[in-house]
């Protein structure tokens, strides 16, 4: 970019230095160089001399015109050809930007991950603006009417300690940049309704050699929430189809879930939970692998989730977590 140039004149942009992408713009250059009546004025964009659409307005001023300017950023400067000077003389430079006003933020969502100490709020910012866009998150207590504001460039983590105005709040987001400002709808939240329980983790698996062999999955969470609903999904690693089991869970002790699985097959398990009746689920837990034995009983432990095989413990590949994505796009 262009900063701290010693100017011998002036460069300016119409309609503005920051403008809406796709507009027609004019860049003006006015020379003020001692003992120089410029023979010619030149414009450079990102260091490359422009050859077209330059109009001389008077002895000291020229205009460069761009139609449908689509570059998010450009560094412009202009020079003068002075008599008796071998080199062009720098007049001045300016960084210009094009972009869009912000869209109305929508899909405003706030959650509290248990034990995080924060309320995390996110929203759909809409299309890329290309220019510096700031967001102000407003949090207003419905009990005390007190309002707090938080400035951010993307999402926001708000300490739950700062939410002293009871349990019920309105949250909304203002988006602003040089080209405009928009405000989201208000989201009403109750702090007790937006808690996502502490992550559920599968710790080990064992297959018991009975008449019909059964696999027991051991899993737990550090949550203090009393009523928790969980889903566990499992499939053979070669399969594209998950089986899902639902559980109403009380995590005062390690959970044991029984499955009747095919012998000598590598399975993958995941679990996730939510506070019963609430809106938000945990993400699916890391992938937990367990290979069922041909006949011999086996145990797979979380500590041994890597591809080593031996006669006593049978253990399987490392967990890789679940798919997450921030890609924008249509639903489907």
């Amino acid at each position: 970019g262009i900063t701290n140039i010693n100017c011998s004149g002036h460069i300016w942009v119409e309609p503005a230095t920051i403008f809406k992408m796709g507009m027609n713009i004019s860049i003006y250059c006015q020379a003020a160089i001692k003992n120089c009546q410029p023979r010619k004025l030149h414009f450079y964009k990102n260091g490359i001399k422009e050859r077209f659409q330059i109009t001389r307005i008077n002895k000291t001023t020229a205009r460069l015109w761009y139609k449908n300017f689509l570059e998010p950023h450009a560094s412009m400067y202009c020079t003068a050809e002075c008599p008796k000077h071998f080199q062009e003389t720098l007049i001045c430079g300016k960084d210009i930007s094009s972009g869009y006003p912000p869209d109305i933020p929508d899909e405003v969502t706030c959650v509290i991950y248990e034990y995080s100490g924060n309320m995390t709020c996110t929203w759909n910012a809409g299309k890329l603006t290309y220019i510096d866009t700031k967001y102000v998150v407003h949090v207003k207590s419905l009990e005390t009417e007190e309002e707090q504001q938080y400035l951010t460039s993307s999402y926001i983590n708000i300490s739950t300690d700062s939410l002293q105005g009871g349990k019920k709040y309105l949250v909304w987001v203002q988006a602003a940049n040089a080209l405009g400002m928009e405000e989201s709808k208000q989201l009403q939240i109750h702090l007790d309704d937006i808690v996502i329980p502490s992550a559920a983790v599968i710790s080990r698996a064992e297959t018991i050699n009975a008449t019909v062999p059964k696999t027991i999955i051991y899993w737990d969470s550090q949550t203090t929430i009393e009523k928790v609903s969980c889903e566990m999904r499992y499939k053979a690693t070669t399969n594209q189809t998950w089986n899902v089991k639902e559980f109403d869970t009380n995590f005062t002790y390690v959970q044991q879930s029984e499955f009747y699985l095919e012998p000598n097959i590598k399975y993958v398990f995941q679990v996730r939970c939510q506070e019963t009746g609430k809106r938000y689920w945990q993400p699916w837990s890391s992938l937990f692998f367990h290979k069922t034995p041909e006949t011999v009983p086996q145990v797979t432990s979380k500590a041994f989730q890597h591809d080593t095989w031996n006669s006593g413990l049978t253990v399987a590949s490392i967990s890789t977590g679940h798919l997450t994505s921030d890609n924008r796009g249509d639903i489907g």
């Epitope: 969502t109 996110t122 999402y155 189809t241 993400p283 798919l323 997450t324 921030d326």
Partner: nanobody
Framework: QVQLQESGGGSVQAGGSLRLSCAAS????????MSWYRQAPGKKREFVSA???????SYADSVKGRFTISQDKAKNTVYLQMNSLKPEDTAMYYC????????????????WGQGTQVTVSS
């Protein structure tokens, strides 16, 4: 915002078939799995099936082998083909977007449809 519209419910004899559709409209920055849940009178809402964004599918044990979930990406629609229907499949069937947690730790809102009624008589 995302809107979900279910259709295809109705009354059918045991052993019969129905095909439910869930059409999603609207624009979102989130990654979603598309799920079907159901709720019978006096019972809690239960998971039925999902079409996951990684291309895998999920089924509850009670419907596995009888129900098939599929997706038409061009139409932003998820289908639930229900065969060999039983009286215990009688319920209101709801379509749901199941969001992934973002890398920021933030969350996208889940959306529910209004539901479509399925009645299976013996």
């Amino acid at each position: 915002q995302v809107q979900l519209q279910e259709s295809g419910g109705g009354s059918v004899q045991a052993g019969g078939s129905l095909r439910l559709s869930c059409a999603a409209s609207g624009y979102t920055y989130c990654s979603y799995d598309m799920s079907w849940y159901r709720q019978a009178p006096g019972k809690k809402r239960e998971f039925v099936s999902a079409f996951n964004s990684d291309g895998t599918t999920s089924y509850a044990d009670s419907v596995k082998g009888r129900f098939t979930i599929s997706q038409d990406k061009a139409k932003n629609t998820v289908y639930l083909q229900m065969n060999s229907l039983k009286p215990e499949d009688t319920a209101m069937y709801y379509c749901k977007t199941d969001p992934h947690v973002q890398s920021s730790g933030g969350y996208c809102p889940p959306y529910w449809g209004q539901g479509t009624q399925v009645t299976v008589s013996s």
